[in-house]
Amino acid sequence: DPLPTESRLMNSCLQARRKCQADPTCSAAYHHLDSCTSSISTPLPSEEPSVPADCLEAAQQLRNSSLIGCMCHRRMKNQVACLDIYWTVHRARSLGNYELDVSPYEDTVTSKPWKMNLSKLNMLKPDSDLCLKFAMLCTLNDKCDRLRKAYGEACSGPHCQRHVCLRQLLTFFEKAAEPHAQGLLLCPCAPNDRGCGERRRNTIAPNCALPPVAPNCLELRRLCFSDPLCRSRLVDFQTHCHPMDILGTCATEQSRCLRAYLGLIGTAMTPNFVSNVNTSVALSCTCRGSGNLQEECEMLEGFFSHNPCLTEAIAAKMRFHSQLFSQDWPHPTFAVMAHQNEN
């Protein structure tokens, strides 16, 4: 997949920033707001920001610029630079009228079918589990294989470096074709197939990627919010995987929720399957020692472990993956349509 160019974004923060730089008033306001970072702590949902008057004034000046509605894309070049601008500008949107975070990612339209050739799988035993089959599909694709080997190397060995492992995981889930990445991670296993479940749980190399001692979930979020990329991915996840009702309706769409979920892998907030026997997922953190923020911590933890939107989205994708290999599929080669952007 070619990386999205700025021009394909409706209003890229990089473009908007360049426009702003050409306007002395906007440029000065942006710089001032950027320097306000130290005086405005990033508030957690339970806190109200305290804002100096000059920062409010700079924010007010930026509210009329094209920066206000600017967005980024997960696969764009200079993504981190774009996100840095987004979060600086986000303060202008929210100062004095604190709004909960809004995802910085724009959903771009993709309609090109992605082809999978299943005929090459005949080298596998017919009764091989689906996680093995999806792993083989990745191996048979040059790009997927190369990216998977890169994180496999970085995340293996007794002395693996966690930050290097995470960076390679992030790269894999960002650059591998979405159906490959989703197939690898969200492969269905028979309820009694522990080997398959273990293979699935080990997809992200949890021994290296996840912290050896579970930190407090709120501390983990604080750490995540200090990094524009992690913060963006978490906010994107909370936007698209918010459950609307107990049926598991997602606030936007299941496909967007899954994309956002996979986008967290390789960040400080990397989730994973909790066992080999079911499809429950969770963050690798604890709410012990949260004091009077216990409820807030449990809500964050529950957004992963007790989220009917996420649970249903994962289940639906696994059902889809099962159907790909069912006997009644008409051709060994078929196209998987990428999801259209929609309202």
């Epitope: 949902p45 909960l100 936007t239 918010h242 459950p243 609307m244 009702d245 107990i246 049926l247 309706t249 997602c250 606030a251 936007t252 769409e253 299941q254 496909s255 809500m299 259209q340 929609e342 309202n343």
Partner: antibody, heavy 115, light 108 residues
């Protein structure tokens, strides 16, 4: 554009039946849970029924349980509400709705139950 | 069934004033599944807030929601002329889903 359009409302006698339809366009209908909500003249909103995106789960308000049936045809992008044994208190404007972050409501269709 | 009671029934305020609407549940509601709607005469409702505190697409920042358990609040920080309408809370935490009876915000 993204919209929901209800039809099938009208005047019916108590004990009669009516089938409401809601045609969806501009979005992938099969990806969404859908609701029916009604509003009696001059009164508040009353939730009626919900159906999961694939039609496998349906739920109803106590006041319509056993009389109304919600269904959907994803190939036709259409939501239905079959209303049997209608009563005077079922008189209302019926809305179909997609209740997500970017919600969509139909314009409503009036059902009048009167002899 | 979960009964939602909104108060006050009517709120008479002037443009620019702050409006605070309350929604009380007969039993605890998971805040993920609490929503607020605005409805103007002759129009369909419009989702304002979902998950107790998240603004729906296109909803102005002057609308905010808060609360947990059995007590939820919708706040309009500074009323604009177009905000005079009826507001409903709804829970989607237990079947049947239910609405509150509504709070009418009228011009004083």
């Amino acid at each position: 554009q993204v919209q929901l359009v209800e039809s099938g409302g009208g005047l019916v006698q108590p004990g009669g039946s009516l089938r409401l339809s809601c045609a969806a366009s501009g979005f992938t209908f099969s990806n969404y849970t859908m609701h029916w909500v009604r509003q009696a003249p001059g009164k508040g909103l009353e939730w009626v029924s919900v159906i999961s995106y694939d039609g496998s789960s349906t739920y109803y308000a106590d006041s319509v349980k056993g009389r109304f049936t919600i269904s959907r045809d994803n190939s036709k992008n259409t939501l239905y509400l079959q209303m049997n044994s209608l009563r005077a208190e079922d008189t209302a404007v019926y809305y179909c709705a997609r209740i997500v972050r970017m919600d969509i409501w139909g314009q409503g269709t009036l059902v009048t139950v009167s002899s | 069934d979960i009964v939602l009671t909104q108060s006050p029934a009517t709120l008479s305020l002037s443009p620019g004033e702050r409006a605070t609407l309350s929604c009380r549940a007969s039993q605890s509601v998971n805040s993920h599944y609490l929503a607020w709607y605005q409805q103007k005469p002759g129009q369909a409702p419009r989702l304002l807030i979902y998950g107790a505190s998240n603004r729906a697409t296109g909803v102005p920042a002057r609308f905010s929601g808060s609360g947990s358990g059995t007590d939820f609040t919708l706040t309009i920080s500074s009323l604009e002329p177009e905000d005079f309408a009826t507001y409903y809370c709804q829970q989607m935490d237990g079947f049947p889903f239910t609405f509150g009876q509504g709070t009418k915000v009228e011009i004083k």
